[in-house]
Amino acid sequence: ITQQDLAPQQRVAPQQKRSSPSEGLCPPGHHISEDGRDCISCKYGQDYSTHWNDLLFCLRCTRCDSGEVELSPCTTTRNTVCQCEEGTFREEDSPEMCRKCRTGCPRGMVKVGDCTPWSDIECVHKESGTKHSGEAPAVEETVTSSPGTPASPCSLSG
């Protein structure tokens, strides 16, 4: 995922509407001019701002990586929402890339949770019911998992 960054400031194009700040702040979908006197609209599909703010530049829209699907496009008030493709997932502690879900559980374990865009399949020990740590198993059973149906975005929104 492309990191949030400042969109380069350009001369105000005709379509970029100006308005006056309220209490020194500009509404979502706008940024403030350097002198603090004007609110300038973000450019649809290019940059955005989600809150009342005094940013000198709107934030650059995220572009979904290959291996991701775009759940919703970037608007002037909300960043793009990207999600891992079916059969892959993104963990909170490694949000930079989608990883392939395991196709099955190690011997002696059973699957209790499907692959979703935000989690790998979940395996527990048959007897104790304790969870597997999540490392790729050395030997896998033939039991395969079907990818979970995407329900909500696992990646960033504004």
Epitope: L6, S22, E23, P27, W52, L56
Partner: nanobody
């Protein structure tokens, strides 16, 4: 890319003082207001103070009013937080923040920020 670097944290006795600095590199602070938040062990991040770099208007959380003073030196691209009469409950990691975010224009307390420093630890203990 906006980068914020805090310094000045350390161990101080109750009643003592510290001055924190926040320097911006790259494309300055990226916003007109710059603020300080803090996060005490096991607690959420809370707003401390903010300053408007254009006109010097300042904002403070009730818990630090009269004890902390925020200031700026635009020529050095730096914002300072002078902390006096420090108390044990001021112990926290202090974060410099820019691109402060508000739910409403009339709000004095931001709900978050776009840009954050790495934080500097302030410990108030005897």
């Amino acid at each position: 890319e906006v980068q914020l670097l805090e310094s000045g944290g350390g161990l101080v006795q109750p009643g003592g003082s510290l001055r924190l600095s926040c320097a911006a590199s790259g494309r300055t602070f990226g916003s007109i207001r710059v603020g300080w938040f803090r996060q005490a062990p096991g607690k959420g991040r809370e707003f401390v103070s903010a300053i408007n770099r254009n006109d010097g208007t300042t904002y403070y959380a009730d818990s630090v009013k009269g004890r902390f003073t925020i200031s700026r030196d635009n020529s050095k691209n730096t914002v300072y937080l002078q902390m006096n009469s420090l108390r044990p409950e001021d112990t926290a990691v202090y974060y410099c923040a820019a691109g402060l975010q508000y739910n409403r224009s009339a709000d004095r307390v931001p709900v978050g920020a776009v840009y954050w420093g790495q934080g500097t630890l302030v410990t108030v203990s005897s």
